[in-house]
Amino acid sequence: EEELQVIQPDKSVSVAAGESAILHCTVTSLIPVGPIQWFRGAGPARELIYNQKEGHFPRVTTVSESTKRENMDFSISISNITPADAGTYYCVKFRKGSPDTEFKSGAGTELSVRAKPS
């Protein structure tokens, strides 16, 4: 059987300051069991952008309906984009465990921020 893939279809996204950015991510399987998280940057210094379980992420909303069954769309929307939000965003699948372990990452989507139109 085919192993789960994490698909980030957009290599880059450009958004005007003050607008919302949609970062697309889908997975190809419901298993292995475990959560999806979003990060900006890679490596040990990466910044957590969204985690469904813990944390407060007031600018982030999930694109898929909160009651959708067998959901494989883990796209997010980030509101009120500023130049400080620029960077590469990764959608990462974790395998459930104690603790959860990283299973597979998407290729990343580079977010660039354009000046707010005057």
Partner: antibody
């Protein structure tokens, strides 16, 4: 229609072994996690074990004694039960996992169950 | 481990009446709670998931509410086939998945 059919239950002595099977049909078996839940006579429901794709999870009460596995080519779930104890006596149900949005798993289809009795 | 406490353990109701029973979680499970019905001699059946969403084919007289640590299942106008045991289950933090001890709804 989704169907789950357990088999392999029976009477076994303490310390003995048993292998339960659950034949699944009506859904894409290999795409879903599947679970064993048991119910002791007159008691409530107790989660036993879940398997995804090679990832396995166990209740503390059965860890090291029970092994969950699956054969996707046969659409079948298994539970190998070793070192059985009297307290393992229960009806064992297999269940198909379901998820909602970004959340964890619940169980949307259940088999009829198979009775395991551990007694000397 | 998250402990789910259901109350009452037994509820005596007349057919046609309303039944309400609760499930309390030992810690916040957000909306990650399901309800199951188990009739005598049968397997459990999923009624409600995400605390309030009715499973396909479940009659409208069943409704779930609550979030966090306090949840309620309500059955309006009990039918004869509704006399059964009802279990809640949390799937917010696992393993282990945990179930409540059940509420038995019996005929008054």
């Amino acid at each position: 229609d989704v169907q789950l059919l357990e088999s392999g239950g029976g009477v076994v002595q303490p310390g003995g072994s048993l292998r339960l099977s659950c034949a699944a049909s009506g859904f894409s078996f290999s795409n879903f996690a599947v679970t064993w839940v048991r119910q002791a006579p007159g008691e409530g429901l107790e989660w036993v074990s879940t398997i995804g794709s090679g990832d396995t999870y166990y209740a503390d009460s059965v860890k090291g004694r029970f092994t969950i596995s699956r054969d996707n080519s046969k659409n079948t779930l298994y539970l190998q039960m070793n070192s059985l104890r009297a307290e393992d006596t229960a009806v064992y149900y297999c269940a198909k996992d379901s998820t909602v949005s970004w959340s964890g798993d619940f169980f949307d289809y259940w088999g009829l169950g198979t009775l395991v009795t551990v007694s000397s | 481990e998250i402990v789910l406490t259901q109350s009452p353990a037994t509820l005596s109701v007349s057919p046609g009446e309303r039944a309400t029973f609760s499930c309390r979680a030992s810690q916040n499970v957000k909306n990650d709670l399901a309800w199951y019905q188990q009739r005598p001699g049968q397997a459990p059946r999923l009624l409600i998931y995400a605390a309030r969403i009715r499973e396909t084919g479940i009659p409208e007289r069943f409704s779930g509410s609550g979030s966090g640590t306090e949840f309620t299942l309500t059955i309006t106008s009990l039918q004869s086939e509704d006399f059964a045991v009802y279990y809640c289950q949390q799937y917010y933090d696992w393993p282990p998945f945990t179930f409540g001890g059940g509420t038995k709804v019996e005929i008054k």
